[in-house]
């Protein structure tokens, strides 16, 4: 019986037309929702004029349906199985789902004038900067509603800045009408321990943002996982979100629905400094802000990022040192609300509901030679906005998994 | 390659006026911001005016405004800085700059002597 069930699994779980795992992975049958909250800074004039904390009030949440496109370019390889495929980006606003409107005003640290400021460090490049802060009427914090935060806004300071220059900002911008990719996975024909692996990422193994074993592409995109899943394992994903492989670990037993899944967690030692767990010294890039390495819980991802300062943690900077944090006023961490999960089926590998929660900071420094960083007497790491996405496995597609999955195994 | 070359520096006395000009060749002029600066004697060398890219926003230190114009002329590639009501404090040596985005750093020219004196 057990052969002959393994042998349908190991069947069905292949990334070919006519499977079980192949309908539901070129358009998800999950619903997808990312729940974002703004922080709000209190207290604008204090900080740039005093260099005082940073005090943030977050507001959210605000909620937009995601990954409800189908994958494009779907594209099988008989040679090495594989199949590759693009990942759209789209996202519908959800009012009912949201505490407000998309129209809803922030107070935000100027992300244009944060990002040129470290950018460009020569002194008289900082002068011509402030010239063009000053003539713009910018300054260090700016109001914006959440849809120009989230998608994109022509920035005043950025349209005076010379030739070549994307005067649009936004946290997410571009977004709508693109696409993630290209992804070249494994099938699993020849393999199924390798099936949704992934084999390279815009057509390389490596990121080319890290040194060593940092810049690696692992395992899967979390959506699923090879089948047969032991607790014992490490699962690995990569996240284009956050430029870097990751990986969770078994937590506990929980019951979905009906369907025994094994909550898999992204432990706190993922996200700790190179003296607590080595793995991660190629994760530090520079001495000074991670003060010679010893502050975790923040990733510099500028590298990603053109240069610009932004760096990911968790919510709240959970898991982050209080060096981190010292500076931000409003913060209140905990475990439940702000870490990320990934329930799985241990039979087929796949990730039936999962919660994937980060915060997107810039990072600010004072300027000698730029007015409205003059005052400043420390760096920060602002907190934007976090995000929690989130999906669940809907009651219908539950059953057909209960009746065709785990009720045949029990 | 890049060459920014300044003239029009001289000896003048308060009150006067002069215009300096730089002349730009080896990067595609009109896409560049155009800056003054000037570096008087033991001091460090500062933003004096700037104008940018087509629209030609222009900019001035508090204590050159009403007294100094910059302008820029994209066929003949050159940048010019009129200089009236000169003062003695205007006494500096007076250095062409271009930059755009692509740069971390100015281009810049050789610098031309102003003296305000009498």
């Known amino acids: 019986g057990d052969l002959l069930i393994q042998k349908t699994i190991k069947k069905q779980v292949v990334l070919e037309e006519g499977t079980i795992a192949f309908k539901n992975w070129v358009k998800t049958g999950t619903e997808v929702y990312r729940q974002f909250w703004i922080f709000d800074v209190q207290n604008p004039q204090e900080v740039m004029m005093n260099s005082s904390n940073i005090q943030v009030k977050q507001r959210g949440p605000y909620t937009y349906r995601v990954r409800f496109l189908a994958k494009e370019n779907v594209t099988q390889d008989a040679e090495d199985n594989t199949v590759s495929f693009l990942q759209p980006n789209g996202a519908i606003f959800e009012p009912s789902l949201s505490v407000g409107t998309e129209a809803d005003n922030f107070t935000v640290l100027n992300l244009a004038v944060a990002a040129a400021s470290h950018i460009y460090q020569n002194q008289f490049v900082q002068m011509i900067l402030n010239s063009l802060i000053n003539k713009s009427k910018s300054s260090m914090f700016q109001v914006r509603t959440l849809r120009e935060l989230l998608w994109g806004y022509r920035d005043p300071f950025l349209s005076l800045v010379p030739y070549p220059v994307t005067t649009t900002v936004g946290l997410f911008y571009p977004y709508n009408n693109t696409a993630d990719g290209v992804y070249k996975v494994f099938n699993g024909k020849d393999n199924i321990s390798k099936v949704a692996i992934i084999d390279t990422y815009k057509g390389k193994r490596n990121l080319s943002y890290w040194e060593s074993h940092c810049d690696m592409i692992n395992g899967t995109d979390a959506a699923s996982f090879p089948p047969f899943v032991e607790k014992s394992q490490v699962l690995q994903f990569f996240s284009s979100d956050i430029c870097r492989s990751i990986y969770a670990v078994f937590e506990s037993d929980v019951n979905l629905k009906g369907i025994p899944v094994y909550r898999f967690v992204l432990p706190s030692k993922a996200f700790a400094s190179p003296v607590e767990n080595p793995d991660n010294y190629c994760f530090c890039t520079e001495k000074i802000i991670s003060k010679n390495c010893t502050s975790y819980g923040v990733l510099d991802i500028s590298k990603c990022k053109e240069g610009r300062p932004v760096y990911i943690s968790l919510p709240h900077f959970l898991y982050a040192s209080p060096d981190v944090s010292e500076p931000i006023d409003g913060l209140n961490p905990n475990e439940e609300e702000h870490r990320t999960y990934l329930d799985i089926e241990p039979i087929t590998g796949f990730t039936l509901q999962f919660a994937k929660r980060l915060q997107v900071n810039l990072l600010v420094k004072p300027s000698e030679k730029i007015q409205v960083l003059k005052n400043l007497k420390r760096n920060y790491i602002v907190p934007i906005l976090w995000l929690n996405e989130t999906g669940t496995i809907g009651d219908e597609k539950a059953n057909m998994f209960r009746s065709q999955v785990t009720g045949k195994i029990n | 390659q890049v060459q920014l070359q300044e003239s029009g520096g001289g000896l003048v006395q308060p009150g006067g006026s002069l215009r300096l000009s730089c002349a730009a060749s080896?990067?595609?002029?009109?896409?560049?911001?155009m800056s003054w600066y000037r570096q008087p004697p033991g001091k460090e060398r500062e933003l004096v005016a700037l104008i940018t890219t087509t629209g030609g926003t222009t900019d001035y230190a508090d204590s050159v405004k009403g007294r100094f114009t910059i302008s820029r002329d994209d066929a003949e590639k050159t940048v010019s800085l009129q200089m009236n009501s000169l003062k003695p404090e205007d006494t500096a040596v007076y250095y062409c700059?271009?930059?755009?985005?692509?740069?971390?750093?100015?281009?810049w020219g050789q610098g031309t002597q102003v003296t305000v004196s009498s």
């Open positions: 700059s271009a930059w755009r985005a692509t740069l971390l750093k100015p281009y």
């Open positions: 080896g990067f595609s002029f009109s896409t560049y911001a």
